[in-house]
Interface confidence: low
């Protein structure tokens, strides 16, 4: 139809700053770049309706829906949303073409639904319409990725079946242990599906999405490596595939490698060797073993030989369902203000695991580091010598696991005193946790040596506040320590604290805190 | 040869649900994603989701997410792609598509299409 | 969702003609751009993957080429059989988006 407008819708993306509800405006805010929305003709629809593609938007965004109209002449608008209409004022740019735009502020549930744009020109009359909904992300998934091997090519391809589509990187070094650390320069990254150079020390695929970030290591035997003191283990579950590379570097090419299963050759097509000279002329063997779908008789030790090194094996373990082997007791600890100390668990997991450290309902990062007898450790050093309960938490796809740790702080305890009329109590965090004195002070003895033993109720650790245990101590009223000052006195074995209390009449009473180490 | 073959033709009511099957024959049917895709009448090749059969893992466009189901059959080497909440707009033909071995490297056998029809 | 955008979207030639068909994209997709050509009634067929490979099975009139957004399709030497509609889609991330398509008639 020769009479239809050229229209143009684009999505506006802002960066947050406003905080009200949606409106029609001629005045877009600061932004990014526009994003083209297609507006086509809608097939099989009554009247001229144009069709922008579909909006997503996360909760709390705010964005800038907009039409521009090459149209000759004036154009009026109305925008319709659940049956309300809205104001909308058309404007003009500099290419004098009709702009129309509708500004949605910090969106919300309400604000998600159909647009709709009724526009009329001097020509014809003609309809937008706008989806709106709020990125789901219950629905997103971030998987660890897999490797395949490219048809017909010395190849590596690496796979995360995650939503929405992960933005898929090799990460490689060349170098040995510390200096291959995420951020060291020794590391290589390369935002490629495909991997050709597979001749490195240490090669992993990860995987990255709105969700996160998740790797997955190409197991490796290096022949030219000290064997470690405990054989290397790889766990994998059924239909998982299997990939175990095996590396060695001798003086000439005169030397092969063999992958044996329980001492049994690997079938044809379940390996593939390659080998490139290195800069100093020594060749470089690689041989991988690989199984596309492993099943529980895939288990067993798998033992690369070569003809010029000694052989070195693996187990690789079939498991049906993940797991998390750790031991779950609780455990207390007890430190010196002063002293240097992390919390740490040991376990065996597969897969790998997503954890955190709490202390007081507050979550910290939680970092592992794999131990060369196939177990994992994570250290927690963050205390800041706070005592109280510190939680480990961690989960992977088919297990949980938590275990609570105890942290107190040796010190001399403080003492706080309160009293009313019937009594007067002292409260102590000290710890270990301390014991209690109660003394007279009058004529008779004016250093209030005279012990009070009646009337006295002791209570260990009455109260927990995120773990920290308090101990009190509280001295019924009696006719014999009215009007006379009392002293109660914590005591452990790092020192004695002391608060010295009036017991006259009720109503503020005056303290006096005695320290005594 | 490897082949891919579809339901035959539906003609459903609007709200209605269909379920369109997609029988896989002629290569190892876990080895290979597949696709889903659609076309209206007089209008161009849209893409619906994908599906893992070897693990079920799926991942579907964000304009059929809440209305698409994909799942398989292993056992008869079978891809079902279920649509709920029928529209006229959803009149169209609906394809499978087996994956090239990575995934990324475009559909190279496609199913003959089912025509689904929505209409009251 | 990165957009596909062919050119032309019809195009009348002859038998022995070349013909260039481009696809654009809305982001950069390295090499992860697909062609297939669908006739009327039938599936659409792969053609070319990433970018320039050539699928088994299909004749060495069709090649392809490009990188990041700007690709192109082209027909050496046109036979009666290619005239129909050929499609470009992208493989980078999903949703996986294709082109509108390119109808070549014959002139």
């Known amino acids: 139809n020769q009479d239809l407008p050229v229209i143009k819708c684009v999505l506006i993306n802002h960066k947050n700053n406003d905080s009200s509800v949606g409106k029609s405006s001629s005045y877009p805010m600061v932004s990014e770049s526009p994003e083209d929305l297609g507006c086509a003709l809608r097939p099989q629809s009554s009247g001229t309706v144009y069709e922008a593609a579909a909006v997503e938007v996360d909760v709390s965004a705010s964005i800038t829906l907009q039409v521009l109209v090459d149209a000759p002449g004036n154009i009026s608008c109305l925008w319709v949303f659940k049956h309300s209409s809205l104001n909308c004022q058309p404007h003009f740019d500099l290419q004098n073409r009709g702009v129309v735009s509708m500004v949605i502020l910090k969106m919300t549930e309400t604000q998600a639904g159909e647009y709709l744009l009724f526009i009329q020109s001097e020509a014809t009359n003609y309809t937008i319409l706008f989806t709106v909904s709020i990125r789901n992300t219950l629905l997103y998934t971030l998987r660890r990725p897999y490797f395949r091997k490219m048809e017909n090519q010395d190849a590596l391809v690496c796979i995360s079946e995650s939503v929405p589509e992960p933005i898929v990187e090799w990460v490689l070094c060349d170098s040995q242990g510390e200096s291959c650390k995420e951020e060291s320069p020794a590391v290589v990254k390369k935002e490629e599906k495909v991997l050709h150079e597979l001749f490195g020390t240490d090669i992993r695929c990860c995987a990255r999405n709105e969700l996160g970030r998740e790797c997955t290591r190409l197991f490796t035997i290096d022949l030219n490596q000290t064997p470690q003191t405990t054989l290397p283990q790889l766990f994998l579950k059924v239909g998982e595939p299997l990939w175990i590379r095996c590396k060695a570097v001798h003086v000439n090419h005169g030397f092969g490698l063999t992958w044996e299963l329980e001492n049994k050759a690997l079938e044809e097509g379940n390996y593939f060797e390659m080998s490139t000279y290195s800069t100093n002329r020594t060749m470089i063997r690689i041989l991988f073993a690989f199984v596309s779908s492993v099943a529980r008789n895939d288990t067993g030790y798998y033992t690369c030989s070569s003809s010029k090194h000694p052989s070195q094996s693996a187990l690789v373990t079939i498991v049906e369902k993940g797991f998390i082997n750790a031991t779950n007791s609780s455990e207390d600890y007890e430190i010196d203000q002063y002293e240097e100390f992390c919390f740490s668990v040991r376990f065996k997991a597969y897969p790998q695991i997503r954890c955190t450290w709490t202390f007081s309902r507050k979550s910290f990062p939680c970092e592992q580091k794999g131990l060369d007898n196939g177990y994992s450790i994570s250290k927690f050093c963050n205390h800041k010598h706070q005592p109280g309960e510190y939680i480990f938490h961690a989960e992977n796809d088919d297990a949980q696991f938590t275990k609570m740790f105890t942290l107190n702080i040796r010190r001399k305890p403080q003492v706080l005193a309160e009293a009313s009329a019937s009594q007067a109590s002292c409260f102590s965090d000290g710890y270990p946790l301390p014991s209690w004195t109660w003394k007279k002070c009058s004529d008779k003895s004016p250093n209030c040596t005279e012990e009070i033993t009646e009337g006295v109720w002791n209570r260990k650790a009455n109260r927990k506040v995120f773990g920290q245990w308090v101990s009190s101590s509280t001295l019924n009223m009696s006719e014999a320590i009215k009007g006379f000052l009392v002293k109660c006195c914590a005591y452990n074995s790092l020192g004695t604290s002391c608060e010295t209390i009036l017991l006259n009449s009720p109503g503020p009473f005056p303290f006096i805190q005695d320290n005594i180490s | 040869q490897v082949q891919l073959v579809q339901s035959g033709a539906e003609v459903k009511k609007p709200g209605a649900s269909v379920k369109v099957s997609c029988k896989a024959s002629?290569?190892?049917?876990?080895?290979?994603?597949m696709h889903w895709v659609r076309q209206a009448p007089g209008q161009g090749l849209e893409w619906m989701g994908w599906?893992?059969?070897?693990?079920?893992?799926?991942g579907y466009a964000q304009r059929f997410q809440g209305r698409v189901t994909m799942t398989r059959d292993t056992s008869t080497s079978t891809v079902y792609m279920e649509l709920s909440s029928l529209r006229s707009e959803d009149t169209a033909v609906y394809y499978c598509?087996?994956?090239?071995?990575?995934?990324?490297?475009?559909?190279?056998?496609w199913g003959q299409g089912t025509t689904v029809t929505v209409s009251s | 969702d990165i957009q596909m955008t062919q050119s032309p979207s019809s195009l009348s030639a002859s038998v022995g003609d070349r013909v260039t068909i481009t696809c654009q994209a809305s982001h950069d997709i390295s090499k992860y751009l697909n062609w297939y050509q669908q006739k009327p009634g039938k599936a659409p067929k792969l053609l070319i993957y990433?970018?320039?490979i050539l699928q088994s099975g299909v004749p060495s009139r069709f090649s392809g080429s490009g990188s990041g957004t700007d690709f192109t399709l082209t027909i050496s030497s046109l036979q009666p059989e290619d005239f129909a509609t050929y499609y470009c889609q992208q493989s980078y991330s999903t949703p996986y988006t294709f082109g509108q398509g390119t109808k070549l008639e014959i002139k």
């Open positions: 598509a087996k994956s090239h071995y990575y995934y990324f490297y475009g559909m190279d056998v």
């Open positions: 990433a970018a320039s």
């Open positions: 599906m893992n059969p070897n693990s079920g893992n799926t």
């Open positions: 002629g290569y190892t049917f876990t080895n290979y994603y």
